[in-house]
Every structure is written in C-alpha cells, then in structure tokens.
Interface confidence: low
C-alpha cells in the first residue's frame, strides 16, 4: 500500500513510510485540539487489494471551551452557535448597563487545551454623577448623590431680585443617559426681555403686553395699502433679541408696473417646541416637587 | 416637625410574616428615596432595602431578596417593609430612613423578634 | 463581614484627638463613591454626622471631620468630649447596595 490518508482531525502516530507490506497495521492519534471519544477505530490494515481498509476521524472531536454563562444584567451570544476552538462568544448588556471589559472573547488553544482568551466582562448599572449646579437656579432632588439610567432631574429658575424673572433657557428636564451622561446640557436661568416691537403703518394682532420675556411671541398685520416685508411671527430669543427681526410694513408701490406681495409674510416661520416638563415615571414640575422644604 | 414614627414592630415566629409601617411627617416621602436599615441585637448596622422617589425602582439585600418587599402608600404619607418567611436570623430593631446616597433622617426604630 | 472595615474600637481622653479609619475596595470607595458617618449614641437611632465625605450637617459641632482617599476614608474627632462616647459607623455605596462598616465603638476614657 502507499502512504495511508491523512485527515483535518486525526495524525499518523510515528513517521509515514512511502510503501506498507499487505497485512501491516498503521495507528492514529486526534490532532492537538482534538479529543478522542470511542467506538470508532483509529488504526487502519493495508488490504491484499493494496488499499487501505475504511478509516475516518470521526471519533476526534475538537477541544471545547468552558461554558460561558450569562452575565448579570447582560447577555453571552455565540456567534457560530458552539464552543468549539475558534469560537467567539460576544456579550451585550441590558438596557441601563454597560460593559466592563472585553466585548468579544475567543476559544483559543493553549498547550492542548481550549480556554477563552480572557476574561468574561460585566455588565454595571450606569450611573450618573449629580448634574450641574446652575446660577440662579436649582434642580430636583439636589441631595441625591448616584443617579441611575434615565433617573431625571428637573430646573427651575429661583425669583429674581429685580421686576423682571429669570427665564430658564435650555431643557428644563435632563435625564441619565446611556454613557453616564446626561442627556442635555444643564439650562441657564437670566433674564430675557425683548424691547417692545413697533411696527410703522402697522399693527400687533396678538401677543399683546406691557413686557415681553422669554419665548414671548407677537404677530402683525399692515395697514391698508402697506405690506410686510419680514416675517409677520417673532420671537423673543435668549440674548434678548426679536428672531426673526421686527418686519417692517412697506408702501403698496402705485405703479402699473409694479406688483404688490399678495402674501402677508416672508421668510421662514420660526417654530418653538416648549421643554419637555417631565419624563415618564418623574413627578411633574407642578407637583411640590420643585419646592422641597428641608432639604 | 420632620420626623419619621414607626410602627409594627413584635415578636412573630419562624416562617411567618409582619409589616412594618413608617408614617413620614413635615415632608412628602415620594420627594425622596426612602430605605429601611436594621440592627442586629448588639451587631452593626446592615441596609435592608431601597425605593426610589419615584416608585419605579426597589433594590434589596441578598438576605431579604425575594422574602420582603418594600412600598410607599403617597395619600398616607407612609413607607412599609412586608416581611415574608421570617428567619431568626432577621431578629433585629428596623430602623426606617429618608435620603438618596446617605440618611439623613432616620424613625426611632421597631424591634422585630423571631422566635419560636 | 462587612464590605467596609472599621476597627472594632478606638479611645481616647477628654481634649484628644481620635481617627477612625474605613477600608473599602475600587468597587465603592474607590469607584469615587462618596463616604458618610454616623453616630449611634447608646439606646438611640443613628445619627447623620458627616455626608459627602467632609461635609457636616447643621448642628455637627466642627470638632467632627471627614477625609477620603483612594479606597478608604476617615473620621476625626478633636477635642474629645464625654458625650462623644457612642458606636460610629462609615457608609458607601456600590451598584444597587448601600453599603455599612461593621462599627467602632468609640470610649472616651
């Protein structure tokens, strides 16, 4: 017979010679990764016919890694579905935690072993420090010191020394976020007051008062024969500006040539989505929550 | 005044059950986190359980897990500690407290004995 | 066992100054928790003496101080007084646990 078969999971035990007598018997072993599990033969004869009788590696079976089990609060996800060596096993975390360590681990062969190539990670709670403090301001629940995933806070301005209050610029409600963060910068609490809007050959049609603060919002309308050149809605933005400017209302040119605007406004419409007031599961700012007594 | 008075407390016998109630005056108790903190008779202090300001979240010790349960009744103004399975090991004075990261506001305590 | 190790005892005479040291792990102390103190005169309820690692509560008289660094904190007492004589204990904090010292008891001799 000439040189018996060689297979992915089983080596000859001993060197291959080129040719074997009738009758003579060659052995194998499992493969350095591989572990031998009974009945099937490992050896093989070399027939009178000159093949070699039917062998196969059937019975080695690759080194496995220990099993791996969930982490709290996460989980271990087989990417090829077994543990075999050359298996990567990634781990995810729960909504609300995050990982510590290695995110991926591989079965590697060590010696004739199979062993993970590190260490399983963990799955920690996120936490948040305590959010900003603010000038003129404060926040709820000012004495908690851990914060944890999606705990929310809610600012408030305090009353202002002057006739004019605070108004609070930015989110009024911020929340713990995913990288132990929060969610929005921390809002600011000043005092925002837009100049009162006179328009010529016009005249306001809501938004009517004395004062006008923060987010304070004024419409207008030409007078006869006049037409607007600007926006016909403005609003009063945090560096105490009207945004988009105060329009003004323009002479109806007379000439044929000439054609009026027929539309009442220009430019773009700004639009103003109020801060989101509480989160779900969160006290609303209205419910004393603001105004803690002892602390 | 802000004060925390306790009530419940007495001597029950091994696998049965007690609760203890804290009625929270001069504050509102779903402003804050709220805890329950127990003494061991001539031992330290050891928490017990947790419930966040908002209800949403309750952690517990390893040795109560699963045997006690902690809730807040807002119209009452008042925490509790439902007390399952009682062990002897669970003799202690219960003390409730108001605070996130530390106490600082604690009742007098309530002495829990189990006993046969 | 507790997580935070406190000596059993610690004791001083009137007018001394006495520490009272607590010993926790990168998992609570020095995952940059803060640490916090009470006071447990005989036959009462604890007492908050120190939040925040150094912070006092109003009416903590200045003679009591915090100090934290790296996985362990400590509590000092000057100017030591016959009222101080009562069981101290740290506090800290690690995922979901509020964490005790097992308690020193402080003899003003």
């Known amino acids: 017979c000439e040189a018996p078969p060689t297979f992915e999971a089983m080596e000859l035990i001993g060197k291959p010679k080129p040719y074997y007598r009738v009758g003579e018997r060659v052995d194998y072993k499992c493969k350095k990764g591989y572990f031998y599990i009974p009945p099937l033969a490992t050896h093989t004869i070399c027939d009178r016919n000159h093949t070699w009788l039917p062998v196969s590696d059937e019975g080695c079976y690759r080194e496995m890694c220990p099993h791996i089990r969930d982490p709290l609060n996460g989980e271990a996800i087989l990417a090829n579905g077994s543990y075999e060596f050359g298996a990567e096993l990634h781990f995810i975390c729960n909504e609300g935690y995050y990982l510590i360590g290695k995110d991926i681990l591989y079965c590697e062969l060590k010696d004739t072993v199979a062993i993970w190539s590190g260490k399983p990670p963990l799955c920690e709670k996120i936490l948040c420090t305590p959010p900003p403090k603010i000038k003129n301001g404060k926040h709820t629940f000012s004495e908690v010191e851990v914060f944890e995933y999606l705990d929310a806070v809610t600012y408030s301005c305090d009353p202002a020394p002057g006739p004019d209050p605070f108004s609070l610029i930015g989110e009024s409600m911020i929340y713990c976020g995913n990288n132990s963060t929060w969610s929005h910068a921390a809002p600011e609490c000043k005092v925002v007051k837009c100049r009162f809007p006179v328009v010529e050959n016009g005249k306001q049609i809501s938004g009517f008062g004395k004062k006008f603060y923060y987010k304070a919002t004024v419409m207008f309308e030409c007078d006869k024969g006049y037409y607007l050149n600007g926006s016909d809605k403005i609003v009063c933005e945090s560096n105490s500006t009207w945004d988009p400017p105060v329009p003004k209302c323009l002479k109806v040119s007379t000439s044929p040539t000439t054609k009026s605007p027929t539309s009442s406004a220009s430019g773009p419409r700004p639009t103003y989505k109020p801060p989101v007031s509480n989160y779900p599961g969160y006290p609303k700012p209205d419910e004393g929550i603001l105004n803690n007594l002892d602390d | 005044q802000v004060q925390l008075v306790q009530s419940g407390g007495g001597v029950v016998q091994p696998g049965r059950s007690l609760r203890l109630a804290c009625a929270a005056s001069?504050?509102?108790?779903?402003?804050?986190?709220m805890h329950w903190v127990r003494q061991a008779p001539g031992k330290g202090l050891e928490w017990v359980a947790v419930?966040?300001?908002?209800?949403?979240?309750?952690y517990y010790a390893d040795s109560v897990k699963g045997r006690f349960t902690i809730s807040r009744d807002n119209s009452k103004n008042t925490l509790y500690l439902q007390m399952n399975s009682l062990r002897a090991e669970d003799t202690a004075v219960y003390y409730c407290?108001?605070?996130?990261?530390?106490?600082?506001?604690w009742g007098r305590g309530t002495l829990v004995t189990v006993s046969s | 066992q507790s997580v935070l190790t406190q000596p059993p005892s610690v004791s001083g005479a009137p007018g001394q100054r006495v520490t009272i040291s607590c010993t926790g792990s990168?998992?609570?102390?020095?995952?940059?928790?803060?640490v916090h103190w009470y006071q447990q005169l005989p036959g009462t309820a604890p007492k908050l003496l120190i939040y925040?690692?150094?912070n006092r509560p109003s009416g903590v008289p200045d003679r009591f101080s915090g100090s934290k660094s790296g996985t362990s904190a400590s509590l000092a007492i000057t100017g030591l007084q016959a009222e101080d004589e009562a069981d101290y204990y740290c506090?800290?904090?690690?995922?979901?646990?509020?964490?005790f010292g097992g308690g020193t008891k402080l003899t003003v001799l």
């Open positions: 419930i966040s300001y908002d209800g949403n979240n309750k």
């Open positions: 990168s998992s609570n102390i020095g995952a940059g928790y803060d």
């Open positions: 407290a108001k605070g996130g990261g530390y106490f600082d506001l």
């Open positions: 506090s800290s904090y690690t995922s979901g646990t509020w964490l």
């Open positions: 001069g504050f509102t108790v779903n402003n804050y986190a």
């Open positions: 925040g690692n150094n």
